[in-house]
Interface confidence: medium
């Protein structure tokens, strides 16, 4: 939280929350469980509806230590499935191409620049 409401929104807090809580299935107790579930569902929905990946982009899942990385091996899940370009059934258009990082089959834009854009976007 910054000193003024105007300075408030930077990606750092969102990045920390995402890395620590996204798909963290091993919370120590009840207070963490509601946070982890909430963050996971929030990010899943955000990445799907805004066609974006992570806070700054797919590299977030590669560069930083995360609960997601602990739960999933890098070859099968370089980034969450929600980062893949989906067909109309909300399934990855081409899962292998997405996992390999083939342009056009995964979203390379971070969600931060989308949600911090025009104030009336949503």
């Amino acid at each position: 939280t910054a000193a003024t409401q105007q300075d408030f929104f930077t990606p750092n807090l969102f990045l920390k929350q995402m890395l620590e809580r996204y798909q963290n299935n091993s919370p120590p107790n009840n207070d963490d469980q509601w946070k982890n579930n909430g963050v996971t569902k929030t990010w899943d929905r955000l990445m799907l509806q805004d066609n974006c990946c992570g806070v700054n982009g797919p590299s977030d899942w590669q560069k930083y230590t995360s609960a997601f990385r602990t739960e999933n091996n890098d070859a099968d899940y370089p980034w969450p499935r929600q980062c893949c370009v989906m067909n109309n059934l909300k399934e990855p258009l081409n899962l292998e191409a997405c996992k390999l990082g083939v342009p056009g089959f995964y979203h390379n834009q971070g969600c931060y620049e989308l949600i911090s854009g025009p104030m009336n976007r949503h």
Partner: antibody, heavy 116, light 115 residues
Framework: EVQLVETGGGLVQPKGSLKLSCAAS????????MNWVRQAPGKGLEWVAR??????????YYADSVKDRFTISRDDSQSMLYLQMNNLKTEDTAMYYC???????WGQGTTLTVSS | QLVVTQSSSASFSLGASAKLTCTLS???????IEWYQQQPLKPPKYVME???????STGDGIPDRFSGSSSGADRYLSISNMQPEDEAIYIC?????????????FGGGTKVTVL
């Protein structure tokens, strides 16, 4: 940046009703659970109500002190959060804050006064 | 019942260090808490999340003079090199969700004065 702007506060007589609104911007509102928290004059903070996102079936939760009198709702298409307050009591007099899921973003608040 | 307890007030000299305590009910001693700062006539501001092992994650823009630690059911907020702008009420909060019920509880707050 995230902005939460509460409106709708005012002076209401006991047993009256009022609806508070919160306009959210700078976040993907429909993915977030949202809360109302209040603070009576000179007193501490009290969590009032919580509503989860559509993917969680808009589940709602209430503090015992407001259960069956207050109703939290949301309009994702307008990025709006609401608190319908019925059968108001003098002890409901407070500043009401709109707060995001993990209690990390707070609005400036709107004041409700319940008095005859 | 989930309860958090804080002392009501504390005074510290300018430039000194402060350590504020938030105590969880014994059966919830493992719980993570949040610390908030509330300056007069302003909404609360998120300071940090503090876990049972003392690890903490501060909010954006919070100076690194603010840190957290834990011991048993106690959660501490430490402020080094106290500044005039640190004068505020510091509140801890904790949430819990069990069996489709949710509750979030705040402590009464500690009013910090900088002398």
């Amino acid at each position: 940046e995230v902005q939460l702007v509460e409106t709708g506060g005012g002076l209401v007589q006991p047993k009256g009703s009022l609806k508070l609104s919160c306009a959210a911007s700078g976040l993907s509102f429909n993915t977030y659970a949202m809360n109302w928290v209040r603070q009576a004059p000179g007193k501490g903070l009290e969590w009032v109500a919580r509503i989860r996102s559509k993917s969680n079936n808009y589940a709602t939760y209430y503090a015992d002190s407001v259960k069956d009198r207050f109703t939290i709702s949301r309009d994702d298409s307008q990025s709006m959060l609401y608190l319908q307050m019925n059968n108001l009591k003098t002890e409901d007099t407070a500043m009401y804050y709109c707060v995001t899921s993990l209690f990390d973003y707070w609005g400036q608040g709107t004041t409700l006064t319940v008095s005859s | 019942q989930l309860v958090v307890t804080q002392s009501s007030s504390a005074s510290f000299s300018l430039g000194a260090s402060a350590k504020l305590t938030c105590t969880l009910s014994s059966q919830h001693s493992t719980y993570t808490i949040e610390w908030y700062q509330q300056q007069p006539l302003k909404p609360p501001k998120y300071v940090m999340e503090l876990k049972k092992d003392g690890s903490h994650s501060t909010g954006d823009g919070i100076p690194d003079r603010f840190s957290g630690s834990s011991s048993g059911a106690d959660r501490y907020l430490s402020i080094s090199n106290m500044q005039p702008e640190d004068e505020a009420i510091y509140i801890c909060g904790v949430g819990e969700a069990i069996k489709e019920q949710f509750v979030y509880v705040f402590g009464g707050g500690t009013k910090v004065t900088v002398l």
